[in-house]
Interface confidence: medium
């Protein structure tokens, strides 16, 4: 049986849209299925690498590389998409290519970023962990860290840093998937939001949706033990 | 407007240290993506970088004068300042100071010079 | 270090010809930059980024190359462009100019 919940929830684009959340329900009358994996049940992905969800992470990462920060003209907020997601009338679409790149770093003068601009993310602001010297982050977003502590400096004078950010990664469903959304979209998924990432190449959604204790290796599930839990 | 001016003792003799300061207006070496490099020419010869300092106290010399340079900066003031140990006449030169281009915006160069200040070794 | 090879050393041009000096690096860069310095001034910079204009350089200036070799046009020389012209590079430390072209109104 499924239980199906509408409701108007703030979206990426800033509108409110009707929303539709299916639950899967258990027939037994218990804990959802969400629930039964966090406590331990027999969940395959959680034990062993997917394959089906290996190729859905790697297809996550492929776009995410060539997504850029769409900022609102009217300043009312930016998110990390791709160009198709982003009014070309309403709204700027950052993304760095040729030339308009920052260089990869001030003792690299010679080579420009291509990956990249990351809404509320750059090496240039970003002090922890700082992009310099051995560790320079490298040219591909969905390989950079989260960054922990900022410049401060209200203002950089880059247009997707200095604007709000509407949307972080949210991992939804069973299948450890990750979508940038706004919060309300989040919660009202029942998904886990991510306020300290700004890529859902940063944070690992199995990770979360299985429970128990972490990951070794976050990229790869080690969870043995729960043939004897259950 | 950004303007930057180069000021120093005019002459000096060798051995001696050579104390340079610029002084700009217009921006400020606290803003982030902000830095301030020094040049020197040769009377009628061409340009050599020998250093330069970003908003983070970042800095970079040229190899070849590492060991005589020093670059600082008083961030409160808007002054840079260069120093050369145990000159000798080859150092003698007009000696610029220029903002670089800012780290922020995507760009690297020498976007604006001061009018240079004239610097002679002599004994 | 990279060593920046500039050619000719000193040129003439009459006023509406059409003048060009190259700029050759010892090993390959990402970007040029190009100065121009008259007499008793300092350099101002005319083109970064190999073929970018600088902000109130005329058009009949410009920029072009890639790798080893590179290149500025005055598309028609004018009495004011007569000065030294240097290339510079951002490529790796030390930071390089070249020895100048000197470009002399004929």
């Known amino acids: 049986a499924q239980h199906v919940t509408t409701q108007l929830v703030l979206r990426n684009k800033g509108v409110y849209e009707s929303v539709k959340y299916i639950q899967q329900e258990n027939f037994w009358i218990g804990p959802s299925s969400i629930d039964l994996i966090h406590l331990g049940a027999k969940f395959s992905p959680c034990i062993r690498k997917d394959q089906q969800i290996e190729q859905l992470v790697l297809r996550e990462r492929d776009l995410e590389r060539d997504s850029g920060c769409c900022v609102q003209n009217d300043h009312s907020g930016c998110i990390q998409t791709q160009r198709k997601d982003c009014s070309e009338t309403l709204a700027t679409f950052v993304k760095w290519q040729d030339d308009t790149g920052p260089p990869m770093d001030k003792s690299d003068l010679g080579q420009k970023r291509t990956s990249g601009a990351v809404c509320h993310q750059d090496p240039r602001t970003c002090e922890e962990p700082a992009s310099s010297g051995a560790h320079i982050w490298p040219d591909d977003i969905t390989k950079w860290p989260i960054c922990t502590e900022q410049a401060k400096s209200n203002r950089t004078g880059f247009l997707h840093m200095d604007c709000q950010i509407k949307g972080r990664p949210c991992c939804i469903s069973t299948k450890g998937s990750c979508e940038i959304t706004t919060r309300e979209y989040c919660e009202f998924m029942h998904g886990y939001f991510h306020e300290e990432a700004t890529l859902c190449s940063q944070v690992h959604c199995l990770d979360k949706v299985c429970g128990l204790l972490p990951f070794l290796n976050p990229e790869v599930p080690d969870q043995f033990y729960r043939l004897w839990l259950s | 407007q950004v303007t930057l001016k180069e000021s120093g003792p005019g002459i000096l003799q060798p051995s001696q240290t050579l104390s340079l300061t610029c002084s700009f207006s217009?921006?400020?070496?606290?803003?982030?993506?902000?830095?301030v490099g020094w040049i020197r020419q040769p009377s009628g010869k061409g340009l050599e970088w020998l250093a330069h300092?970003?908003?983070?106290?970042?800095?970079y010399y040229n190899p070849a004068l590492q060991s005589r340079l020093t670059v600082s900066k008083d961030t409160a003031k808007n002054q840079v300042f260069l120093k050369i140990a145990n000159v000798d006449t080859a150092d003698t030169a007009i000696y610029y100071c220029?903002?670089?281009?800012?780290?922020?915006?995507?760009?690297?160069?020498?976007?604006?010079w001061g009018t240079g200040t004239t610097v002679t070794v002599s004994s | 270090q990279i060593v920046l090879t500039q050619s000719p050393a000193i040129m003439s041009a009459s006023p509406g010809e059409k003048v060009t000096m190259t700029c050759s690096a010892s090993?390959?860069?990402?970007?040029m930059y190009w100065y121009q310095q008259k007499p008793g001034s300092s350099p101002r910079l005319l083109i970064y980024?190999?073929?970018n204009l600088a902000s109130g350089v005329p058009v009949r200036f410009s920029g072009s190359g890639s790798g080893t070799s590179y290149s500025l046009t005055i598309s028609r020389m004018e009495a004011e462009d007569a000065a030294t012209y240097y290339c510079?590079?951002?490529?790796?430390?030390?930071?390089?100019f070249g020895a100048g072209t000197k470009l002399e109104l004929k």
């Open positions: 510079q590079q951002w490529n790796s430390y030390p930071l390089t």
């Open positions: 300092i970003w908003w983070d106290d970042d800095k």
């Open positions: 217009g921006f400020s070496l606290s803003t982030f993506g902000m830095g």
């Open positions: 090993s390959s860069v990402s970007y």
């Open positions: 980024d190999t073929s």
């Open positions: 220029a903002r670089v281009g800012n780290y922020g915006s995507n760009y690297w160069y020498f976007a604006v």
